[in-house]
């Protein structure tokens, strides 16, 4: 007996040929005995089976001794065994249907778990592997999870269920709401103005929710909101913003923030959340602030930093065009003394530089500048 | 696994150069900066100086600086120490190390270079 | 430049014994901002690359066997090897990564009394 696998939803041709080249009577039944189609001359007829609006045949075909039965719009319940009677003889085909689904939105929060669930005729047992975007291959039996998706399980999967040494093939799209980066970090000279953004990793037509920014600052107790907003297709309109500092909110996306000075106070860590409409749970973003300052104080240069910075990183005070002065794994260093001319204050990783900060320091009768 | 392998050993004469290359596998390469340290025969570990993979900038200590060029071809993950005006004290074994923090986590197998008339 | 100093220049040990190396740093190695020793520990066979065992002072290395340990803060570091085994012999040099230039303390050889 053949076996043909189908997906619910395709539509599926199991063939029965005839030894003769020319068209002949045939019968298509089922495994009750019930027909379903068969031919009359050159004329289709159909019988009293559940499959009436949804099965026929290729006419064409039929010269060449070929009498196909096509099932449209595969139903699980459309799995048995179909028989083609031509020629005095029974042609035996066992078709079996299989569905594939997600088991909620396919459009799901990072974080959040993806379930696949197949469902298959009584009898059968069939086995499923999936294979994500990224190559991670999962298997399973009637349902397989994934847990905590992650940004690069967006797109295609692409799941094999087998029976009986056959397979066939489903591909579903998925997509992880989500931001593009987890975290980032911004690297600013006092006084400069700061740019965040908050670029998604999706689109969609319509997008609803609200958001939030919570700032920990570095030398505050704790963490205090520092925007509130909405999202409304795609618009943003801020509901409230602190005071100190008083950032500024782009109407469009992605969602972009500016704080207008760089000061010590506000360096540290941010969280930005988004909780879209109809989805549970949110979107989160990391992003951070390091803030740089150069100073002299009677006979003191310092450099100092503020912010999450890593224990890697090189803090370096040096008169432009020689060595450095003075270079540590610190957050602040200082030359006693320090002599005229243009002096540098980098903060480095492994070379590449990460802010930088100039300071003019004049012969000791005059006070110093700063560009 | 990261691995370090370094060009083969030279002999070189007073006042010449040497290039001694560093080719990286089985890392990313633009992520780190490469150390060059130096042991003369029997004795301690000295430091020459760091090229950023990233960028290229790099760090020469100072008893070196001016006779000592690093250099990286990111096409080949490799990085070059070429030390020129060559003395008989220049004569040492030659490493290249991976620095992420400052320490050196992977060495290369060295480089003999002896400097002799 | 800070100045790494080791004692002893050598050190002989019974297998299974502990051997104990001290490095002193000519300034502070802490640092106040990160409050981590910028302090690493390597070991040099004959013929061989150093190899990192120990790094901020006191993290063992993967893949470092457990008998090696080290501590210290500041300005005085000490590394342990709780019983010496036959494959321990080597030199073993200690390294300051607080401030550059690197510098590396001038080597303690250990070898089996």
């Known amino acids: 007996k053949k076996v043909v696998l189908g997906k619910k939803g395709d539509t599926v041709e199991l063939t029965c040929t005839a030894s003769q080249k020319k068209s002949i009577q045939f019968h298509w039944k089922n495994s009750n005995q019930i027909k379903i189609l068969g031919n009359q001359g050159s004329f289709l007829t159909k019988g009293p089976s559940k499959l009436n609006d949804r099965a026929d045949s290729r006419r064409s075909l039929w010269d060449q001794g070929n009498f196909p039965l096509i099932i449209k719009n595969l139903k699980i319940e459309d799995s048995d065994t179909y028989i083609c009677e031509v020629e005095d003889q029974k042609e035996e085909v066992q078709l079996l249907v299989f569905g594939l689904t997600a088991n909620s939105d396919t459009h799901l929060l990072q974080g959040q778990s993806l379930t696949l669930t197949l469902e298959s005729p009584p009898g059968s047992s069939p086995s499923v592997q999936c294979r994500s975007p990224r190559g991670k291959n999962i298997q399973g039996g009637k349902t397989l999870s994934v847990s905590q998706l992650e940004l690069q399980d967006s797109g295609t999967w692409t799941c094999t269920v087998l029976q009986n040494q056959k397979k066939v093939e489903f591909k579903i799209d998925i997509v992880v709401l989500a931001f593009q980066k987890a975290s980032s970090i911004v690297y600013k000279k006092e006084g400069e103005q700061v740019e965040f953004s908050f670029p998604l990793a999706f689109t969609v037509e319509k997008l609803t929710g609200s958001g939030e920014l919570w700032w920990q600052a570095e030398r505050a107790s704790s963490s205090k909101s520092w925007i509130t907003f909405d999202l409304k297709n795609k618009e943003v309109s801020v509901k409230r913003v602190t005071q100190d500092p008083k950032l500024q909110m782009g109407k469009k996306l992605p969602l972009h923030l500016t704080l207008p000075q760089a000061l010590p106070q506000y360096a540290g860590s941010g969280n930005l959340t988004l909780a879209l409409e109809a989805k549970t749970g949110k979107l989160h973003q990391e992003v951070n602030l390091v803030v740089m300052r150069a100073t002299q104080l009677q006979k003191n240069l310092t450099c100092e930093v503020w912010g999450p910075t890593s224990p890697k990183l090189m803090l370096s005070l040096k008169l432009e065009n020689k060595e450095a002065k003075v270079s540590k794994r610190e957050k602040a260093v200082w030359v006693l003394n320090p002599e005229a001319g243009m002096w540098q204050c980098l903060l480095s990783d492994s070379g590449q530089v990460l802010l930088e900060s100039n300071i003019k320091v004049l012969p000791t009768w005059s006070t110093p500048v700063q560009p | 696994q990261v691995q370090l392998v370094q060009s083969g050993a030279e002999v070189k004469k007073p006042g010449a150069s040497v290039k001694v290359s560093c080719k990286a596998s089985g890392g990313t390469f633009s992520s780190y900066a490469i150390n060059w340290v130096r042991q003369a025969p029997g004795q301690g570990l000295e430091w020459l100086g760091w090229?950023?993979?990233?960028?290229?900038?790099?760090n020469y200590a100072q008893k070196f600086q001016g006779r000592v060029t690093m250099t990286r071809d990111t096409s080949t993950s490799t990085v070059y120490m070429e030390l020129s005006s060559l003395r008989s004290e220049d004569t040492a074994v030659y490493y290249c190390?991976?620095?992420?923090?400052?320490?050196?986590?992977?060495w290369g197998q060295g480089t003999l270079v002896t400097v002799s008339s | 430049d800070i100045v790494m100093t080791q004692s002893p220049d050598s050190l002989a040990v019974s297998l299974g014994e502990r051997a104990t190396i001290n490095c002193k740093s000519s300034q502070s190695v802490l640092s106040s901002s990160y409050n981590k020793n910028y302090l690493a520990w390597y070991q040099q066979k004959p013929g061989q690359p150093p190899k990192l065992l120990i790094y901020w002072a006191s993290t063992r290395e993967s893949g470092v066997p457990d008998r090696f340990s080290g501590s210290g803060s500041g300005t005085d570091f000490t590394l342990t090897i709780s019983s010496l085994q036959a494959e321990d012999v080597a030199v073993y040099y200690c390294q300051q990564y607080y401030s550059s230039p690197p510098t590396f303390g001038g080597g303690t050889k250990v070898e089996i009394k």
């Open positions: 090229i950023s993979a990233y960028n290229g900038n790099t």
């Open positions: 190390a991976r620095d992420l923090v400052g320490h050196f986590d992977y």
